[in-house]
């Protein structure tokens, strides 16, 4: 439905508050280095303009596309060239090339200072003094650090952020009330950002069909009672929403997400019995709740898949005449029967089925050729099952920190060219799969673990794409979206790697380590571990364990010493010498 003024249409649909918030998110995700005040000024100008268009849709420039309006506004930033360098060249382009250019310059790892949390009283004062600015600043700081954060979901986080301050700043013990809530929001926010980053990577690097296949599998697991036509409609709508958000079209995305939530709730009887509670909530909570809703129960009397997908005489005809529909139905039918499989496994099975049909259908006896296709699935199913079993056993034996360390060593040996901060960040996140998923019963372990690993490995892929250093990483990241995890799992020690020169400075520590939080101290130790492996890639587990145990003892000893700095200087030298001897450096 065409509107005379797109900006007026979205302003009316979303309301002023959400409109302003979404424009701020959009601008902060594009111009990640711009100061908060500059963005607020731009947002206010856009909002005032939108209001004039609401009053008169025929007013000057109101017929322009949102990309044109927003792009023109971003290109008025005076410091564009000195702050962003070649990104300023985007402004010489016309739409839609200009927006594509801005998208290509989004930085997954912007050079921004770490967000330091002020004292609770300071935060509460700021919240009370100017609630609107305080919340806008939250949106701005998250959006610029996470340029692909799912914008309508960020509005939900901001609502929870506001609620936490509203409640806790009145509490007797403000810190006890607020800090756990902020920790939870931070952790959930990071997870949400990473999940959305995978969706955008899927769309941008592998195309709409890859995303749709993922969505068919996931929604079929979640809504196994829904008909294929219903799932297909939801997939089409969901794809539109995520395509818009990943493309920077945040107003359209938020509007369409609200429409999708409305549709789902109006049709929940034909979708899922689990949606009732979600659908009673306000919009932002409703959309979030639907996105996280548990899988509905599987229909009791589902027939064997073989009838339609192996035994039917029309298998090859159906495949050849409409692959998207036929393979979509296969994926739907398989996924609704297997909530115990990861989405990526289901996609691998569908790809195997497709490849087999493509190979067999032109043969003299197609049925004979593809009759055993389901037998080909067995090793594909067993591979992640065995991997998860082994790693959960290792996790239960070691605990999270040491399990992370085992993964750090494993991944540094596989891809030692990758930067140490990236290896630490990714391996720590990979290690979290243990506490996240190993507690689940067998039937929930694989979807939890393998789909989570897909999200984490995508972080590695997007960080590596910015500064490519390893052909092996590039290969695993680009060849197949669904085979990324098996590709990384299959990598052995990189025999071509030339060990890094030993640098004593890398292993020099100071008394400031003693005041760090437990998490920060772990990161310091894990950074040292990665560097050790880069110096000595052939070091055994035992050698590395001995050095790390000595290192932990050294930190503990010096942090208890009266003259900490002297202890770190003197004992540090001894530790470096002993470690070099132990590792034969």
């Amino acid at each position: 439905d065409a509107h005379k003024s797109e900006v007026a249409h979205r302003f009316k649909d979303l309301g002023e508050e959400n409109f302003k918030a979404l424009v701020l998110i959009a601008f902060a995700q594009y111009l990640q280095q711009c100061p908060f005040e500059d963005h607020v000024k731009l947002v206010n100008e856009v909002t005032e303009f939108a209001k004039t268009c609401v009053a008169d849709e025929s007013a000057e420039n109101c017929d322009k596309s949102l990309h044109t309006l927003f792009g023109d506004k971003l290109c008025t930033v005076a410091t564009l060239r000195e702050t962003y360098g070649e990104m300023a060249d985007c402004c010489a382009k016309q739409e839609p090339e200009r927006n594509e250019c801005f998208l290509q310059h989004k930085d997954d790892n912007p050079n921004l200072p770490r967000l330091v949390r002020p004292e609770v009283d300071v935060m509460c004062t700021a919240f009370h003094d100017n609630e609107e600015t305080f919340l806008k600043k939250y949106l701005y700081e998250i959006a610029r650090r996470h340029p692909y954060f799912y914008a309508p979901e960020l509005l939900f986080f901001a609502k929870r952020y506001k609620a936490a301050f509203t409640e806790c700043c009145q509490a007797a013990d403000k810190a006890a009330c607020l800090l756990p809530k902020l920790d939870e929001l931070r952790d959930e926010g990071k997870a949400s950002s990473a999940k959305q980053r995978l969706k955008c990577a899927s769309l941008q690097k592998f195309g709409e069909r890859a995303f749709k296949a993922w969505a068919v599998a996931r929604l079929s697991q979640r809504f196994p009672k829904a008909e294929f036509a219903e799932v297909s409609k939801l997939v089409t709508d969901l794809t539109k929403v995520h395509t818009e958000c990943c493309h920077g079209d945040l107003l359209e995305c938020a509007d369409d997400r609200a429409d999708l939530a409305k549709y789902i709730c109006e049709n929940q009887d034909s979708i899922s019995s689990k949606l009732k509670e979600c659908c009673e909530k306000p919009l932002l909570e409703k959309s979030h709740c639907i996105a996280e809703v548990e899988n509905d129960e599987m229909p009791a009397d589902l027939p064997s898949l073989a009838a339609d997908f192996v035994e039917s005489k029309d298998v090859c005809k159906n495949y050849a005449e409409a692959k998207d529909v036929f393979l979509g139905m296969f994926l739907y039918e398989y996924a609704r029967r297997h909530p115990d499989y990861s989405v990526v496994l289901l996609l691998r099975l569908a790809k195997t089925y497709e490849t087999t049909l493509e190979k067999c259908c032109a043969a003299a006896d197609p049925h004979e050729c593809y009759a055993k296709v389901f037998d080909e699935f067995k090793p594909l199913v067993e591979e992640p099952q065995n991997l998860i079993k082994q790693n959960c056993e290792l996790f239960e034996q070691l605990g999270e920190y040491k399990f992370q360390n085992a993964l750090l060593v494993r991944y540094t040996k596989k891809v030692p060219q990758v930067s140490t901060p990236t290896l630490v960040e990714v391996s720590r996140n990979l290690g979290k799969v243990g506490s996240k998923c190993c507690k689940h019963p067998e039937a929930k372990r694989m979807p939890c673990a393998e789909d989570y690993l897909s999200v984490v490995l995508n972080q590695l892929c997007v960080l590596h794409e910015k500064t490519p250093v390893s052909d092996r990483v590039t290969k695993c990241c680009t060849e197949s979206l669904v085979n990324r995890r098996p590709c990384f799992s299959a990598l052995e020690v990189d025999e071509t790697y030339v060990p890094k020169e030993f640098n004593a400075e890398t292993f020099t520590f100071h008394a400031d380590i003693c005041t760090l939080s437990e998490k920060e101290r772990q990161i310091k130790k894990q950074t040292a571990l990665v560097e050790l492996v880069k110096h000595k890639p052939k070091a055994t587990k035992e050698q590395l364990k001995a050095v790390m145990d000595d290192f932990a003892a050294f930190v503990e000893k010096c942090c208890k010493a009266d003259d900490k700095e002297t202890c770190f200087a003197e004992e540090g030298k001894k530790l470096v010498a002993a470690s070099q001897a132990a590792l034969g450096l």
């Epitope: 495949y319 050849a320 692959k323 493509e358 032109a362 197609p366």
Partner: antibody
Framework: EVQLVESGGGLVKPGGSLRLSCAAS????????INWVRQAPGKGLEWVGI???????FYATWAKGRFTISRDDSKNTLYLQMNSLKTEDTAVYYC???????????????WGQGTLVTVSS | AIQLTQSPSSLSASVGDRVTITCQSS???????LSWYQQKPGKAPKLLIY???KLTSGVPSRFSGSGSGTDFTLTISSLQPEDFATYYC???????????FGQGTKVEIK
């Protein structure tokens, strides 16, 4: 030597019919997916249709109903029956095999030399 | 409607030049079902590349293909005298009935 040889082309009036043949030597056509591809004079390539080893046929949307592909295994020959011919069907018609291991992909490796069909009054 | 658009429609180049031909598909091809053919006057086409980037056996390594989804490229790294010909891309889609070719790119001697 493995080869495909088309025949049966010639001049035909609009509305008329023609049957093209594609004879194979060195390969057993019944083990292959075979396509017909045409090329109007001075123009590009256009896929007409395919017959799989099993005998199942598929056609380009524009060819459905007018063109029929068949095969005679005893003669190791493929046919293209063309009815209700139009002037725009004037072209060189090639038969070509799909690369083994594929059924629906546009990978055509072995080609005949082509036969010219002219539809004109 | 399915469209496979090649550009340029013709180009002039010299022996030793690097030549790039693009093929744009709407909608995206199915599962990288994209091929490249070479055709010389009066002859049948010859398959050079399949699955967007795989070289058919016997085809010189100066030919290479890349791309996925909607955008594909054929590159001849160093044009040889025998490479002057017309090049076609071929695309496969969800329905076999939509199999189609680009309109061709004629590579001529400068």
């Amino acid at each position: 030597e493995v080869q495909l040889v088309e025949s049966g082309g010639g001049l035909v009036k609009p509305g008329g019919s023609l049957r093209l043949s594609c004879a194979a030597s060195g390969i057993d056509l019944s083990n292959y997916a075979i396509n017909w591809v045409r090329q109007a004079p001075g123009k590009g390539l256009e896929w007409v249709g395919i017959i799989w080893a099993s005998g199942t046929t598929f056609y380009a949307t524009w060819a459905k109903g007018r063109f029929t592909i068949s095969r005679d295994d005893s003669k190791n020959t493929l046919y293209l029956q063309m009815n209700s011919l139009k002037t725009e069907d004037t072209a060189v018609y090639y038969c070509t095999t799909t690369v083994p291991g594929y059924s629906t992909a546009p990978y055509f490796d072995l080609w005949g030399q082509g036969t010219l069909v002219t539809v004109s009054s | 409607a399915i469209q496979l658009t090649q550009s340029p429609s013709s180009l002039s180049a010299s022996v030793g030049d690097r030549v790039t031909i693009t093929c744009q598909s709407s909608p995206s091809v199915w599962s990288n079902f994209l091929s490249w053919y070479q055709q010389k006057p009066g002859k049948a086409p010859k398959l050079l590349i399949y699955e967007a980037s795989k070289l058919t056996s016997g085809v010189p390594s100066r030919f290479s293909g890349s791309g996925s989804g909607t955008d594909f490229t054929l590159t001849i790294s160093s044009l040889q005298p025998e490479d002057f010909a017309t090049y076609y891309c071929g695309g496969g889609y969800s329905s076999i009935s939509d199999t189609t070719f680009g309109q061709g790119t004629k590579v001529e001697i400068k």
